[in-house]
Amino acid sequence: SGKSFKAGVCPPKKSAQCLRYKKPECQSDWQCPGKKRCCPDTCGIKCLDPVDTPNPTRRKPGKCPVTYGQCLMLNPPNFCEMDGQCKRDLKCCMGMCGKSCVSPVKA
C-alpha cells in the first residue's frame, strides 16, 4: 500500500507455547484500527499496540540471511520496514513471507 508506516514496532513475541492456533486477525497494519500494528503473536497474527523504537531510521551492521522456498500466502504482512524498528541487533529482512526482524549474518 502507498500509505506511510505506522509508528513503533511490534512487541516481542512471547516465548510461551501455543495450545490453540487462531485464524489471522489482519494482513497488514492498515487492517488494524487506530495505531495498532499487525503483529505475530504466540498463537497467530493479531492487531497489537506497538512499542516505541529509539532510532527507527538507523541501519544496523551485518547482512540479511538468504531465504529459500516460496511463500504460500498472498500479500504477506511486513512486521517491520527498517532496521531501527527491530530490537537489539536484529535487522529488518525480507523472509519467505514478508519482512521481519531476524539475526543478521556477518558481512
Epitope: R20, Y21, K22, K23, P24, E25, C26, Q27, Q31, C32, P33, K36, C38, K46, C47, L72, M73, L74, P76
Partner: antibody, heavy 122, light 108 residues
Framework: QVQLQESGPGLVKPSQTLSLTCTVS??????????WSWIRQHPGKGLEWIGY???????YYNPSLKSRVTISVDTSKNQFSLKLSSVTAADTAVFYC??????????????WGQGTLVTVSS | EIVMTQSPATLSVSPGERATLSCRAS??????LAWYQQKPGQAPRLLIY???TRATGIPARFSGSGSGTEFTLTISSLQSEDFAVYYC??????????FGQGTKVEIK
C-alpha cells in the same frame, strides 16, 4: 438463538458503491470469540469469501477484492457492514453475512444470514 | 490461493442409497476443511468441520473423512431432504478461504 439479517438496497448502479449491513441477534459481537464475514454467490454459481472483521475492528479481506472492499463494525448496534466500491454487472450476487469461530479448531461458518440479492444495473 | 475441486459435478442417487462426494485441494489444508449443504433459495448450512466433526444438530448419516488434499463427504442413506448442492471449504493457514464449485445431489 443466534440470527443474522442482511439489509440494504437490492439495486445499485454501475460504478457506484454497494452498501450492506448485517444485524446480529442472540450473541454480542463485542464479546469477541468470532470473526464476522461477508460471502457472496453469483447467480447459479459457487460461493466466494469477501472478508471478515473482528469485534475490535481488525479486518482481513480477500486479495482479489481488497482494493474495493471495506468491512466495518458497530458494536453499539451489534452490526457489521460491507462496502464494495466501483461495482459492475459482474458484482451482481446474493450477499450473505456469516459467523465463524476465531480458532482453527472451531471450523467453518456456523451461522448465516438468509442472503440478499444485489443487482448491479443502470 | 488454494483451489478446491469437487467431483462429480452432479450425482444421481436413489433415496436410501449411499452418496460419496469428493473434494480435492490444490495444496495441503491439513484437516481445516468444512462441508455445507445448500437448498434452492436458502443459505448454506454447516454440516462438517475439521474434515470429520459433525456440526451441532447434523444427523449421523453425514460423515466426513480425509486430510491433506483429499476429502470425502458420505451420506450413508439418502433421505428426501438431502437432495441439495454440497460445497467444501478450506480455512487453512491464511485467507482467502475458498470453496469448491459444488456437487449437486439429485434424485435418480
Amino acid at each position: 438463538q443466534v440470527q443474522l439479517q442482511e439489509s440494504g438496497p437490492g439495486l445499485v448502479k454501475p460504478s457506484q458503491t454497494l452498501s450492506l449491513t448485517c444485524t446480529v441477534s442472540g450473541v454480542s459481537i463485542s464479546s469477541g470469540g468470532y470473526y464476522w464475514s461477508w460471502i457472496r454467490q453469483h447467480p447459479g454459481k459457487g460461493l466466494e469469501w469477501i472478508g471478515y472483521i473482528y469485534y475490535s475492528g481488525s479486518t482481513y479481506y480477500n486479495p482479489s477484492l481488497k482494493s474495493r472492499v471495506t468491512i466495518s463494525v458497530d458494536t453499539s448496534k451489534n452490526q457489521f457492514s460491507l462496502k464494495l466500491s466501483s461495482v459492475t454487472a459482474a458484482d451482481t450476487a446474493v450477499f450473505y453475512c456469516a459467523r465463524e469461530g476465531e480458532y482453527y479448531d472451531e471450523g467453518g461458518f456456523d451461522y448465516w444470514g438468509q442472503g440478499t440479492l444485489v443487482t448491479v444495473s443502470s | 490461493e488454494i483451489v478446491m475441486t469437487q467431483s462429480p459435478a452432479t450425482l444421481s442417487v436413489s433415496p436410501g442409497e449411499r452418496a460419496t462426494l469428493s473434494c480435492r485441494a490444490s495444496q495441503s489444508v491439513s484437516s481445516n476443511l468444512a462441508w455445507y449443504q445448500q437448498k434452492p433459495g436458502q443459505a448454506p448450512r454447516l454440516l462438517i468441520y475439521g474434515a470429520s466433526t459433525r456440526a451441532t444438530g447434523i444427523p449421523a448419516r453425514f460423515s466426513g473423512s480425509g486430510s491433506g488434499t483429499e476429502f470425502t463427504l458420505t451420506i450413508s442413506s439418502l433421505q428426501s431432504e438431502d437432495f441439495a448442492v454440497y460445497y467444501c471449504q478450506q480455512y487453512n493457514n491464511w485467507p482467502p478461504w475458498t470453496f469448491g464449485q459444488g456437487t449437486k445431489v439429485e434424485i435418480k
